[in-house]
């Protein structure tokens, strides 16, 4: 946020940039939280726009019994590894096909025993305030589906009749990581010393980090004809004086007619 200055007063202004503002020769360049000619005003809203999507990663291990382990499978650039990766990915795409949050799988390691597959199941959902619940539900469905397939697709008489067969007891979920996004925490942090006065309000499921000086929200402070200004002690209404009235009161809702006051003064003279 910048304000341009023209004329002789500019040099004077340069030394007066407040709140960490820097003079660029023309104007005060204000840090994120401030604006105004001297960076003297505190912004009333801070952009904490959430990410478009939130991701989760499940670390799983399954044991594939329909493939015999060979040394080539240790080498991720070998043709054998690439083929295994393709078949395993196709199989997992079928297993998880009913999960809208499912993105894919990423094999991290193959080891002996028929083939023990250490891999990540990748999940993603559009950001909404309920993203944690959505991803928690998706991880539960992943567990259900992989447990089901590794119980059903098993070798019979040393032969597999499915794309892949599994060892029922070899399925483990090691870890689940969900990208953390906490708009309240972000809002507090970005508001710095004004953190106590900034709150998160939602509109169309999007979080807005606002102070009571931002109009149009449930916490908005109504200063009537006055101006809302943020200070370290909270939001305050700066009341205006018009040609006909003085305004006062906490929300500038008390108007005093100037003519009455002047009339009173004349009466004293």
């Amino acid at each position: 946020r910048t304000t341009t200055c023209f004329g002789d007063g500019c040099q004077n202004t340069a030394s007066r940039c407040k709140n960490g503002g820097t003079w660029d020769g023309l104007k005060c360049q204000c840090p994120n939280l401030y604006y105004g000619e001297l960076c003297e005003e505190v912004v009333s809203s801070i952009d904490i726009g959430p990410p478009e999507t939130i991701s989760a990663q499940m670390e799983l291990t399954v044991t594939v019994t329909s493939v015999k382990f060979t040394e080539e499978l240790k080498n991720h650039s070998s043709q054998e590894f690439q083929e295994f990766k393709q078949t395993f990915t196709e199989q997992m795409n079928i297993v998880y096909s009913g999960i809208p949050e499912y993105v894919g799988v990423n094999i991290t390691k193959l080891r002996l025993g028929s083939v023990v597959v250490e891999h990540d199941v990748l999940l993603r959902t559009k950001y909404t305030p309920e993203y944690k619940t959505v991803l928690d539900n998706a991880t539960e469905v992943v567990k259900e589906k992989i447990t089901k397939v590794t119980t059903q697709q098993i070798m019979i008489n040393d032969i597999c009749s499915d794309m892949m067969c599994f060892n029922t007891t070899g399925t483990q979920v090691q870890n689940i990581t969900v990208t953390q996004y906490d708009p309240e925490e972000d809002c507090r942090k970005m508001a710095k010393e004004y953190g106590d006065y900034f709150v998160v309000e939602y509109r169309d499921q999007k979080p807005y980090c606002i102070s009571p000086c931002e109009p149009g929200f449930s916490v908005s402070k109504n200063c009537n004809l006055g101006k809302c200004q943020m200070s370290l002690s909270g939001p305050q209404c700066l009341c205006v004086t018009t040609e006909t009235h003085w305004y006062s009161g906490e929300t500038c809702n008390q108007g005093t007619q100037k003519s009455l006051v002047y009339g009173h003064h004349h009466h004293h003279h």
């Epitope: 043709q79 070798m155 597999c160 794309m163």
Partner: nanobody, 123 residues
């Protein structure tokens, strides 16, 4: 690139024999799994016979004792000796391969395929 080319199909009388061949190029013949699948008109593709790099073989119940699978690693070739042929053996026979040591009869596990050769058993 792996290329599989089948040959040896044709018309044969019930009880007769045929030998199918599959020439594999670009495939490391001493590794992985090679197989014969077949598809009869209006039916799903089914696994017939399988051979692994160590010579381990397996067969579909319907052909056990009648069909023999073998591979010649030096010639990069796969064979299927079919004896005592029946009318129900009529199908297009496909050669399939995987670089992996597979123990599955499911066609989806095999990435490499030939074009197929027709076998008709009829009197």
């Amino acid at each position: 690139d792996v290329q599989l080319v089948e040959s040896g199909g044709g018309l044969v009388q019930p009880g007769g024999s045929l030998r199918l061949s599959c020439a594999a190029s670009g495939f490391p013949s001493s590794r992985g799994t090679m197989a014969w699948f077949r598809q009869a008109p209006g039916k799903e593709r089914e696994g017939v016979a399988f051979i692994n790099s160590d010579g381990r073989t397996s067969y579909a119940e319907s052909v056990k004792g009648r069909f023999t699978i073998s591979r010649d690693n030096a010639l990069s070739s796969l064979y299927l000796q079919m004896n005592s042929l029946r009318a129900e053996d009529t199908a297009v026979y496909y050669c399939a391969a995987s670089l992996l040591y597979l123990m599955t009869v499911n066609a989806a596990a095999y990435p490499y395929w030939g074009q197929g050769t027709m076998v008709t058993v009829s009197s």
